[in-house]
């Protein structure tokens, strides 16, 4: 079959090869499209409601005055010339619609380095077939799920026209010390070949570099974290940042079920209080930051306590404050 692509709403003429140029003609068109149930036969005599959709012209060609999505399918013509020789024509018709120029909506004017940011949402309306949206950074294609790039896509179909609306939301994590004014654009690639991509106007958000946080200091009293049974340990979490962040406490890597407080008092220490404690400062703008961990231990009378109760600063691990 010969592949034919036709733009929605435009006329289409399909030639019936081998047909005499003028009547009388012995020919028949067979259609299997979205408008038909199995095969529909059209003859030069025509007439009836089909004439508004497709009719046979005097030269035997099939004329569709305005192609629609339902006209996609197979068109066959069987013609016999004056000498009785039979010729068959076979067409596979596909339709398309070029959407309006895609647009970036809800675009960010500023991104924060080192954390995921929504750049914007690319919208293309009125395509057929659906086609695809892709993002570009400084003219180069961005690959989702690589280097802090994620894309959330949505495709909707108009209930009446059957045309597609595509949406693509771009999230990126700009590298610290990277380009302070990256250029993002989005392009629509049609679902049918031989049609060029349509590109949005570019956007150039600023990249803001957060000032590195000063370290969260965990102060233990008594120093070293070793205490006699029944003694009291006071843990204080010192964060230089303003405004003061929320401070939660961890024991052995697990959040303690307490409200935020910069001070944790452990009175009358018993064996069950022994363990590794740390504090987590949660800033509204930076996310959680954990202190070094300190080891709280009980020293029996006559024992020498360790000189330092700290263990290496642990990462956040599976931090999920309820």
């Amino acid at each position: 079959a010969q592949n034919i692509t036709a733009r929605i709403g435009e006329p289409l003429v399909l030639k019936c090869k081998g047909a005499p140029k003028k009547p009388p003609q012995r020919l028949e068109w067979k259609l299997n499209t979205g408008r038909t149930e199995a095969w529909k036969v059209l003859s030069p005599q025509g007439g009836g409601p089909w004439d508004s959709v497709a009719r046979v012209l005097p030269n035997g060609s099939l004329f569709l005055p305005a192609v629609g999505i339902q006209d996609e399918g197979i068109f066959r013509c069987q013609a016999m010339n004056r000498n009785g020789k039979e010729t068959k024509s076979n067409y596979r018709v596909r339709v398309y619609q070029i959407p309006g120029k895609p647009e970036i909506v809800d675009s960010a004017s500023e991104l924060t380095a080192g954390v995921p940011n929504k750049v914007g949402t690319c919208v293309s309306e009125g395509s057929y077939p659906a086609g695809t949206l892709s993002w570009h950074l400084d003219g180069k294609p961005l690959v989702p799920n690589e280097k802090g790039v994620s894309v959330k896509e949505q495709t909707r179909r108009h209930p009446e026209t059957g045309l597609f609306t595509l949406q693509s939301e771009l999230m990126v994590t700009p590298a610290r010390g990277g380009d302070p004014r990256p250029t993002f654009s989005c392009s629509f690639s049609p679902g049918l070949p031989r049609h060029r991509a349509l590109r949005t106007a570019p956007i150039q958000p600023r990249v803001w570099e957060p000032v590195p946080l000063e370290e969260v200091q965990l102060v233990v009293e008594p120093e070293g974290g070793a205490v006699a049974p029944g003694g009291t340990v006071t843990l204080t979490c010192e964060v230089p940042a303003q405004p003061s962040p929320q401070i939660h406490w961890m024991k052995d890597g697990v959040p303690l079920p307490l409200p935020p407080s910069p001070v944790l008092i452990l009175p009358e220490i018993g064996p069950q209080d022994q363990g590794t404690y740390s504090c987590v400062a949660t800033h509204s703008s930076h996310g959680p930051q954990e202190s070094r961990a300190v080891s709280i231990s009980i020293i029996e009378p006559g024992e020498e306590g360790p000189t330092a109760g700290s263990v290496g600063g642990s990462g956040l691990g599976t931090l999920a404050l309820a």
Partner: antibody, heavy 117, light 109 residues
């Protein structure tokens, strides 16, 4: 509807132990702290301790350390409190309450524990 | 250990505004005490009203509000109703220790 269903009244002998339960329904059990509170007859409320059902981590009022043990069973969305070495001082109504660290919005109906020989 | 003090009893009339307070023996109550207010009705029916000083629990009528007044935590009922007759407990967090007040018996006549 969010509910905390507690076990019925308990009559126990001095020196014995009792384990009371608090079954949560209508919300995600592991998303909230469970808080336990004691109300002695004619007295105010006393905080016993908290448990984080997600991790099983606990924190106790010093007064109840060694007296109360808090546990959870995530599969049945149930929190438990065991009270050991019971004396007449432990006769009270015990409540569980759902908390998101600083709120206690939903409370159980309470479990009355009577310690008597 | 800190002591939390409340009015032992208050009386109001329907439609009136009434304020219950909660004082700390350690000094001024601040937002770091996460003041809570809990209502007890007959038959040991407890409901959390306010948490974190001024956050109303879901489903609690808007006539209940929490605040700090001077150096105390306060619960204000604007337009009291007869069904608000109950005992109201406040609770304050002190770092990692929770202390309840003695409760205020509110009568709505």
């Amino acid at each position: 509807e969010i509910q905390l269903q507690q076990t019925g009244p308990e009559l126990v002998k001095p020196g014995a132990s009792v384990k009371i339960s608090c079954k949560a329904s209508g919300y995600s059990f592991t998303d909230y702290i469970m808080l336990w509170v004691k109300q002695s007859h004619g007295k105010s409320l006393e905080w016993i301790g908290n448990i984080n059902p997600y991790y099983g981590s606990t924190f106790y009022n010093l007064k109840f350390k060694g007296k109360a043990t808090l546990t959870v069973d995530k599969s049945s969305s149930t929190a438990y409190m065991q009270l050991n070495s019971l004396t007449s001082e432990d006769s009270a109504v015990y409540y569980c309450a759902r908390s998101d660290y600083w709120y206690f919005d939903v409370w159980g109906a309470g479990t009355t524990v009577t310690v008597s020989s | 250990q800190a002591v939390v003090t409340q009015e032992s009893a208050l009386t109001t009339s329907p439609g009136e505004t009434v304020t219950l307070t909660c004082r700390s023996s350690t000094g001024a109550v601040t937002t770091s005490n996460y003041a809570n207010w809990v209502q007890e009705k007959p038959d040991h029916l407890f409901t959390g009203l306010i948490g974190g000083t001024n956050n109303r629990s879901p489903g609690v009528p808007a006539r209940f509000s929490g605040s700090l007044i001077g150096d105390k935590a306060a619960l204000t009922i604007t337009g009291a109703q007869t069904e608000d007759e109950a005992i109201y407990f406040c609770a304050l967090w002190y770092s990692n220790h929770l202390v309840f007040g003695g409760g205020t018996k509110l009568t709505v006549l």
